[in-house]
Amino acid sequence: ECGHISVSAPIVHLGDPITASCIIKQNCSHLDPEPQILWRLGAELQPGGRQQRLSDGTQESIITLPHLNHTQAFLSCALNWGNSLQILDQVELRAGYPPAIPHNLSCLMNLTTSSLICQWEPGPETHLPTSFTLKSFKSRGNCQTQGDSILDCVPKDGQSHCSIPRKHLLLYQNMGIWVQAENALGTSMSPQLCLDPMDVVKLEPPMLRTMDPSPEAAPPQAGCLQLSWEPWQPGLHINQKCELRHKPQRGEASWALVGPLPLEALQYELCGLLPATAYTLQIRCIRWPLPGHWSDWSPSLELRTTERAPTHHHHHHHH
């Protein structure tokens, strides 16, 4: 190996200068005693190398590239060998940006998977390998004092979310949570969230059903629908409020919202609708009065208003 490149830094801010040195050993006797060292960035020859013989007989060329504007490139030093270019050594150069502060960190507690799922926006492209780590700790108070650290949560490559499993969670106790982004040019941290996992619980929605007509109950009036819902059992003991939305199946009408309805209502007569019209209905719920996240909308129920006993059919779409 006749030549060796060393660089001031292999990874720099995009647009920053970079200085490189190429040294050719004296014992490369088959070479021209006064070889001219050439520099190449990618496929382009780079002028401006300053060459000198050192006291030990080695040859050195130093070049300063004033602005590295490629996010990735190979810098090589070479000699003319006959009528071809003989590459002595090359290094990979990378340029990019330190990570921006991750923002919009939010979490939700999934009671079925028993995990706290947090997501964030990573910010602009850094052009460099950048790792994200969800960091957290348990806290007895309002996260001013740090309790036990929780094992770091590292998302899969390219993902901006991570799940903290139940074994690392303590319900009804605050946790400090933040995202750390790191690459070769620096580290940044999102603002810290302080939350009790139960305060970000996202419940499953109830299942809408038609009310079975009973002999003693009066049939619904024209423009009315009778419906009931079956709460999601594992969330039954959590106080919730719900809301219903409906729209005619035909036409371009937007959803009309009805609520709040207590989860416990379990049944409801919706009036003021167009008679003899097919409607699509959905329901969703949220922990209340304590904090929580809205559930997804339930699968749709399709019902038809009528002046006689209502006819109906179920149609579930999952979103």
Epitope: T113, S114, R166, M198, P231, P234, L236, P262, A265
Partner: antibody
């Protein structure tokens, strides 16, 4: 401090009725589900019934369905269990308990003994 | 209905022993599993809720683990006041069901 105090237990003949009460203090009673759990002498725990915070949802164990009625009076912070058509196998200590959001029982009252015997 | 099977039904152990009690659900219940301790003549006391959360005031030698159908209550170093009967309970759906209990006795 959260406290639950049961009363109303005693000796009753088969086919008879009894009404248990549970007085609650130390928490906002109207925000929580409540429940009854019983324990026959020398046996394990058996869930009997629960009631939602406003009283609209009242699941029962199959063994008491149609005979027992759970109710609550949020203005009096009191939970009730009306027991009709009592049988010998209903003999047990009856505990009232507050239900947590994910369905655990805590705390429990001290229990009241119901004995059904002729 | 979900069945809850606890094992063993009884065990003998010495102070300082590590004790493990298992509870198996007949179908998946996520983490909706709670553990109670009951001493003779007393009301049950909640130890662990949602499979692994230690109730306030319960010593840290008690721990819970598991999810789905298989759950474990562990007492890392048995103390004299731990001799009692332990029950698991599922709260995934109604009817709420308790395990048959495990009596921990002094060897």
């Amino acid at each position: 401090e959260v406290q639950l105090l049961e009363s109303g237990g005693g000796l009753v003949q088969p086919g008879g009725s009894l009404r248990l009460s549970c007085a609650a203090s130390g928490f906002t009673f109207s925000l929580y589900w409540m429940g009854w759990v019983r324990q026959a002498p020398g046996k394990g725990l058996e869930w009997v019934s629960s009631i939602s915070s406003s009283g609209g949802v009242t699941p029962y164990a199959d063994s008491v369905k149609g005979r027992f009625t759970i109710s609550r009076d949020n203005s009096k912070n009191t939970l009730y269990l009306q027991m009709n058509s009592l049988r010998a196998e209903d003999t047990a200590v009856y505990y009232c308990a507050k239900l947590g959001e994910l369905g655990w029982f805590d705390p429990w009252g001290q229990g009241t003994l119901v004995t059904v015997s002729s | 209905d979900i069945q809850m099977t606890q094992s063993p039904s009884s065990l003998s152990a010495s102070v300082g022993d590590r004790v493990t009690i298992t509870c198996r659900a007949s179908q998946g219940i996520s983490s909706y599993l709670n553990w109670y301790q009951q001493k003779p003549g007393k009301a049950p006391k909640l130890l662990i809720y949602y499979a692994s959360n230690l109730q306030n005031g319960v010593p840290s030698r008690f721990s819970g683990s598991g999810s789905g159908t298989d759950f474990t209550l562990t007492i890392s170093s048995l103390q004299p006041e731990d001799f009692a009967t332990y029950y698991c309970q599922q709260s995934w759906e109604y009817p709420l069901v308790f395990g048959g209990g495990t009596k921990v006795e002094i060897k």
